[in-house]
Interface confidence: medium
């Protein structure tokens, strides 16, 4: 008898549920006390009839949707609901991050391509300078310039290349050609074996003056910033990809099942979860993911700081597109000192007896109109610069992305408005009260199931990567004044700072980029080198600070190759029809 009453109650409850959220209406005559509605819904999840009871059953084997009376759910149905709930959650998460993911992927691709275009232009400008001013150098010069800019591209993309070595190699290669083709055009072939000697003399005698050092400063600073910028964007994609594909725990699956599906077991097909209840469940399910929030915020703000400083010598467009001019100036420097150099090199490389040295005449003016170049360059720079700022503004709108995720997902899945007449995981209530819900479930599996186990290993890993990139981004924070107020030509040549002896300097050209604020830079990565000595016979001076070895960890040169982006084919499967 009692069973019949409970069955009748269940049927009445099913019928009542059809009226939400409208006005209460008198119930129609009760149909057969069956699980027909539940069955027809469940068949959308799982074809076949075998799992759904025909009529309500005691449900003593249920573990999640614990019944207060007869139920239309079986253990197998419960398992299917759990699986579906976790899939729904993953799809909701992917749809939540789709816009952000697309924003970063698109921009990473755009900037990578833009930087490659800048490198290509810079190479063309430099080749044009050689062609128009030093045609006799062109075959070899084109080759050396090509190699240099290939290395620049590779460096930007994360290759383990030393910028100072690139610059040294360029000038080491150029000087023998300049010497044999320009300074001594009639040098016999037998003298070509002096190339190695000339390469050495290039550094020992500082034949290009301080120009190689200037180029090292500019190129290393600008390329490091560019590289870290791309690295940061790619890590952003990795962060989103990681959280996008999180697998939710079984505990979370149980909570989601209780929230989205347990009402069906009681025949309440149209009931929606209470908003407050949804938030509590989502916060529990996403506790690990939300831990990313702090580091994600820092990531966006650090990236903004980096972008704000990407100008002058920290802007690769500015530096690379003006490189042809500096190289031209460096060759002119050689020409001005040709007389003295040829005598010294004659002795040094033991060819002074073979011939009379003479200096050739060289054109002083660049065929390329620097003013035109400059104008075109500024426009290009502005385009990229504004694009960077635009990206940052858009990213800042996602600064609370992770902390807002639980709320976002609840607002994008069916929940009852105003928390009235809603499902609290156990029963239909007029108004949701977290306390009441907790008390009513004392002996049930409840929110305490979601013990704070700490974030998933993949989340911990991505947090570590974010910490690392944030540290790098802070490292790259550009000096705020002293250096940027100086003329570009002065960069790296501040008197008394780093050019007076053989010691390495940590800041002669300003607060350099590889310096980690309040971070040790100890000897760990001797990424660059600096020889500073006032005696001739020492190696070419390289850029202070950017190429030092230091007692403090040089995090600015940590090379993590940029990952190729996986194609973004996200199919967001709408599951509202499943839970509505």
């Amino acid at each position: 008898m009692a069973g019949t009453v409970r069955t009748a109650c269940l049927v009445v409850a099913m019928l009542l549920s059809l009226d939400f959220p409208g006005q209460a209406q008198p119930p129609p005559p009760p149909p057969d006390a069956t699980c027909h509605q539940v069955r027809s819904f469940f068949q959308r999840l799982q074809p076949g009839l075998k799992w759904v009871p025909e009529t309500p059953v005691p449900g003593s084997d249920l573990q999640v949707c614990l019944p207060k009376g007869p139920t239309c759910c079986s253990r197998k149905m419960e398992e299917k609901y759990q699986l579906t709930a976790r899939l729904n959650m993953e799809q909701l998460l992917q749809s939540a991050s789709m816009e952000l993911k697309f924003l970063i992927i698109q921009n990473a691709a755009v900037f990578q391509e833009a930087f490659e275009i800048v490198v290509r232009h810079a190479k063309n400008y430099t080749n044009a300078m050689f062609k128009n001013n030093y045609p006799s150098l062109t075959p070899q010069a084109f080759e050396f310039v090509g190699e240099f800019f290939t290395d620049v591209s590779l460096y930007i993309l994360g290759s383990d290349i030393n910028v100072d070595d690139m610059v040294n190699e360029l000038f080491d290669s150029l000087f023998p050609v300049i010497y044999t083709q320009l300074m001594n055009p009639g040098l016999p072939d037998s003298a070509l074996d002096i190339n190695e000697c000339l390469r050495g003399a290039r550094r020992d005698l500082k034949v290009f003056g301080n120009f190689p050092k200037l180029i090292m400063t500019q190129v290393s600073k600008s390329l490091q910033v560019t590289r870290i910028f791309l690295q940061a964007l790619n890590l952003g994609i990795e962060v989103i990809n990681t959280t996008d594909h999180l697998k939710f725990s079984k505990d979370c699956g149980r909570m989601l099942t209780r929230m989205w599906y347990c009402s069906y077991c009681q025949g309440l097909m149209m009931v929606k979860p209470c908003g407050g209840y949804c938030n509590v469940v989502m916060q529990g399910c996403m506790a690990g993911v939300v831990e990313i929030d702090k580091y994600w915020r820092e990531y966006i703000l650090s990236l903004e700081e980096l972008v704000n400083g990407m100008y002058r010598i920290y802007d690769m467009e500015n530096v690379l597109l003006g490189l042809f001019s500096t190289i031209h100036d460096s060759i002119q420097y050689v020409q001005k000192n040709a007389g003295k150099l040829t005598t010294t090199i004659g002795k040094l490389c033991a060819h002074s007896q073979q011939r009379q040295y003479r200096s050739a005449y060289y054109p002083e003016d660049l065929f390329i109109d620097k003013k035109v170049l400059k104008v075109a360059h500024v426009e290009h720079e502005e385009t990229l610069s504004s694009r960077r700022r635009e990206l940052i503004q858009k990213l800042k709108s996602f600064i609370s992305f992770y902390s807002a995720l639980p709320g976002y997902i609840c607002s994008h899945s069916p929940v009852a408005e105003n928390d009235t007449l809603c499902w609290n995981g156990q029963e239909l209530v007029e108004r949701y009260s977290q306390k009441a819900a907790r008390n009513g479930m004392k002996n049930q599996f409840n929110l305490h199931e979601l013990k704070m186990k700490g974030p998933e290993p993949v989340v911990s890993q991505i947090i570590d990567k974010l910490k690392h990139i944030n540290q790098l981004l802070r490292t790259m924070s550009m000096p705020k004044g002293r250096v940027l107020d100086k003329n570009l030509d002065e960069e790296g040549f501040e008197s008394g700072d780093c050019g007076d002896d053989e010691d390495e300097c940590i800041g002669g050209s300003g607060d350099g980029m590889i310096k980690v604020k309040n971070q040790l830079r100890f000897l760990a990565e001797l990424a660059y080198d600096l020889d500073v000595d006032d005696a001739p016979g020492n190696s070419q001076q390289a850029t202070p600070k950017d190429n030092e070895i230091s007692t403090f960890h040089n995090l600015g040169n940590v090379h993590s190759p940029l990952k190729l982006l996986t194609s973004m084919a996200i199919s967001v499967v709408c599951f509202f029809f499943l839970v509505h």
């Epitope: 010691d503 310096k515 980690v516 830079r521 000897l523 080198d529 020889d531 070895i549 230091s550």
Partner: antibody, heavy 115, light 112 residues
Framework: QVQLVQSGAEVKKPGASVKVSCKAS????????MHWVRQAPGQGLEWMGA????????AYSQKFQGRVTLTADKSISTAYMELSRLRSDDTVVYYC????????WGQGTLVTVSS | DVVMTQSPLSLPVTLGQPASISCRSS???????????LHWYQQRPGQSPRLLIY???QRPSGVPDRFSGSGSGTDFTLKISRVEAEDVGVYYC?????????FGSGTKLEIK
């Protein structure tokens, strides 16, 4: 020219602390790391730690970790080395020296630890 | 830590004669950037150390050209082409390429 001038000799009791100063001149103090090296009488050189005056960042030898503190006052271009919980075997000469090849050294400060 | 082993511990030399001091490191001091972070110091009696050679073979200004450094990897040599009276003292090799910087135990050069 570059000069590093250290404070004078000190006599300390075991368990006490000593603070040695190193005043730099002739270059931009914040542009170079300052390292501290010590030398027991008739013995070799032993690296103690390093300081980046610009940021205040420090690195210490494991042997002295917890006992040595390196600081700097940029306004007067002076680096300091403080060694605490002195023992008799800390009776040595302490040098400040400019990184990285240690081309410039202070004149040394003899610290005698004796009860 | 990188262990620096110097030999000989004592080196008696006749004035005007050459002298050679050897230094061996427990691991290579050649960095991937191609430079060797090995330096030589001279310490005259009662004085602070003085840099003689840096990066294996580079001579700072003011150091007489009778001092030269050579070697690579783990084996290094300091040569004095003609010993003079002022060269008396202890010579140390040291490396600054790996954490922490370390020094050899020293070679005492004396006049025979």
């Amino acid at each position: 020219q570059v000069q590093l001038v250290q404070s004078g000799a000190e006599v300390k009791k075991p368990g006490a602390s000593v603070k040695v100063s190193c005043k730099a001149s002739g270059y931009d103090f914040t542009a170079y790391e300052m390292h501290w090296v010590r030398q027991a009488p008739g013995q070799g050189l032993e690296w103690m730690g390093a300081l980046d005056p610009k940021s205040g960042s420090t690195a210490y030898s494991q042997k002295f970790q917890g006992r040595v503190t390196l600081t700097a006052d940029k306004s007067i271009s002076t680096a300091y080395m403080e060694l605490s919980r002195l023992r008799s075997d800390d009776t040595v000469v302490y040098y400040c020296t400019r990184f990285y090849s240690y081309a410039h050294w202070g004149q040394g400060t003899l610290v005698t630890v004796s009860s | 830590d990188v262990v620096m082993t110097q030999s000989p511990l004592s080196l008696p030399v006749t004035l005007g004669q050459p002298a050679s001091i050897s230094c061996r490191s427990s691991q290579s001091l050649v960095h991937s950037n191609g430079y060797t972070y090995l330096h030589w110091y001279q310490q005259r009696p009662g004085q602070s150390p003085r840099l003689l050679i840096y990066k294996g073979s580079q001579r700072p200004s003011g150091v007489p050209d009778r001092f030269s450094g050579s070697g690579s990897g783990t084996d290094f040599t300091l040569k004095i082409s003609r010993v003079e009276a002022e060269d008396v003292g202890v010579y140390y090799c040291g490396q600054s390429g790996l954490t922490p910087p370390t020094f050899g135990s020293g070679t005492k050069l004396e006049i025979k």
